[in-house]
């Protein structure tokens, strides 16, 4: 069964910068990836980026740069302008659509150990979740 992993990282040097990494584990070629925050797109979440393998990417603030890392994984850099660092408690969701198989979605957030008050940056560990 295909699975989606989501990993949220805070940049060690800039506490206001976050990166969301998402990947698709399974057969099929990806046609579209949608990244949202605050929940899944369509269920109260806000769309941050849409990535198409051929037609390119669209992104919305506070997304800074969305890109493909491999044919089945993407990364999205975010710039947190607020001093209170709201990203720390936010859920990020990635939905991978593959034709004709369908869509798979997972959500993740910054691990609790990644609190800005801590000196060492977190070790990136994929957050595996069953699709919603």
């Amino acid at each position: 069964t295909p699975e989606v992993w989501v990993q949220v990282q805070m940049e060690a040097t800039e506490l206001s910068s976050f990166t969301v990494h998402c990947g698709f584990l399974g057969p099929g070629s990806i046609s579209l990836v949608t990244v949202s925050w605050g929940g899944p797109d369509g269920a109260g979440g806000t769309k941050l980026a849409v990535l198409h393998p051929e037609l390119g990417t669209r992104q919305w603030a506070p997304a800074r740069q969305a890109r493909w890392e491999t044919q089945s994984s993407i990364s999205l850099a975010l710039e947190d302008s607020g001093a209170s660092s709201p990203f720390a408690n936010t859920t990020f969701c990635c939905k991978f659509a593959s034709f004709p198989e369908g869509s798979w979605e997972s959500c993740g957030s910054l691990p609790p150990s990644s609190d800005p008050g801590l000196s060492a940056p977190p070790t990136p560990v994929p957050i595996l979740r069953a699709d919603l």
């Epitope: 849409v50 034709f99 869509s103």
Partner: antibody, heavy 120, light 107 residues
Framework: DVQLVESGGGLVKLGGSLKLSCVAS????????MSWIRQTPEKRLELVAA????????YYLDTVKGRFTISRDIAKNTLHLQMSSLKSEDTALYYC?????????????WGQGTSVTVSS | SIVMTQTPKFLLVSAGDRVTITCKAS??????VAWYQQKPGQSPKLLMY???NHYTGVPDRFIGSGYGTDFTFTISTVQAEDLAVYFC?????????FGGGTKLEIK
């Protein structure tokens, strides 16, 4: 203007074969996923077969697996559905349709349909 | 496969009425739902995608809502040209499946 024009339907005997064609125009045919959808006499819609833009990944309705084959000829902008061992339940109006990635794979263009009647 | 149960099968309404069609999925399909309109003698036409997004040229009297398993399609003010059969469809998991259709008739 996007257009999809089906042909090849007709009256066929039980167990017979038929090849449907759909000529596409007005868009880059090779960049889109395509499918065949049928509408039964009861007006129910069923996705029969689909093919990814990469021409590798395909889908078939369980009841047509092993009997139907979807393919496309990029040079001729044509989608095909080869149907064999036809059954009475294959009687329907067959549409070809284009899927749009940005619309959640919804079918944004449909042909006018070609009728297939399987008789005993 | 995912079953899309659409109700009602028939609707007899007057021009100007507000009508609602519901579609219930047998499991969550998130927001991967489209709605189509099929006028007599014509092929189906896309009205809405991702539940609530209007396809090009579709009037805003057509409204889609829902998420997960329960979806509604509303025509806020029915017009004579809305005489048609309406279908919901899920594209969340293969095989894509359609609702049974709702035939809208105008008094």
């Amino acid at each position: 203007d996007v257009q999809l024009v089906e042909s090849g339907g007709g009256l066929v005997k039980l167990g017979g074969s038929l090849k449907l064609s759909c000529v596409a125009s007005g868009f880059t045919f090779s960049s889109y996923h395509m499918s065949w959808i049928r509408q039964t006499p009861e007006k129910r819609l069923e996705l029969v077969a689909a093919i990814n833009s990469n021409d590798i990944n395909t889908y078939y309705l369980d009841t047509v697996k092993g009997r139907f084959t979807i393919s496309r000829d990029i040079a001729k902008n044509t989608l095909h559905l080869q149907m064999s061992s036809l059954k009475s339940e294959d009687t329907a109006l067959y549409y070809c349709a284009r899927h749009e990635d940005y619309y959640g794979f919804a079918m944004d263009y449909w042909g006018q349909g070609t009728s297939v009647t399987v008789s005993s | 496969s995912i079953v899309m149960t659409q109700t009602p099968k028939f609707l007899l309404v007057s021009a100007g009425d507000r009508v609602t069609i519901t579609c219930k999925a047998s499991q969550s399909v998130t927001n991967d739902v489209a709605w189509y309109q099929q006028k007599p003698g014509q092929s189906p036409k896309l009205l809405m995608y991702y539940v609530s997004n209007h396809y090009t040229g579709v009037p805003d009297r057509f409204i889609g809502s829902g998420y997960g398993t329960d979806f509604t399609f509303t025509i806020s003010t029915v017009q004579a040209e809305d005489l048609a059969v309406y279908f919901c469809q899920q594209a969340y998991r293969s095989p894509w499946t359609f609702g049974g259709g709702t035939k809208l008739e105008i008094k």
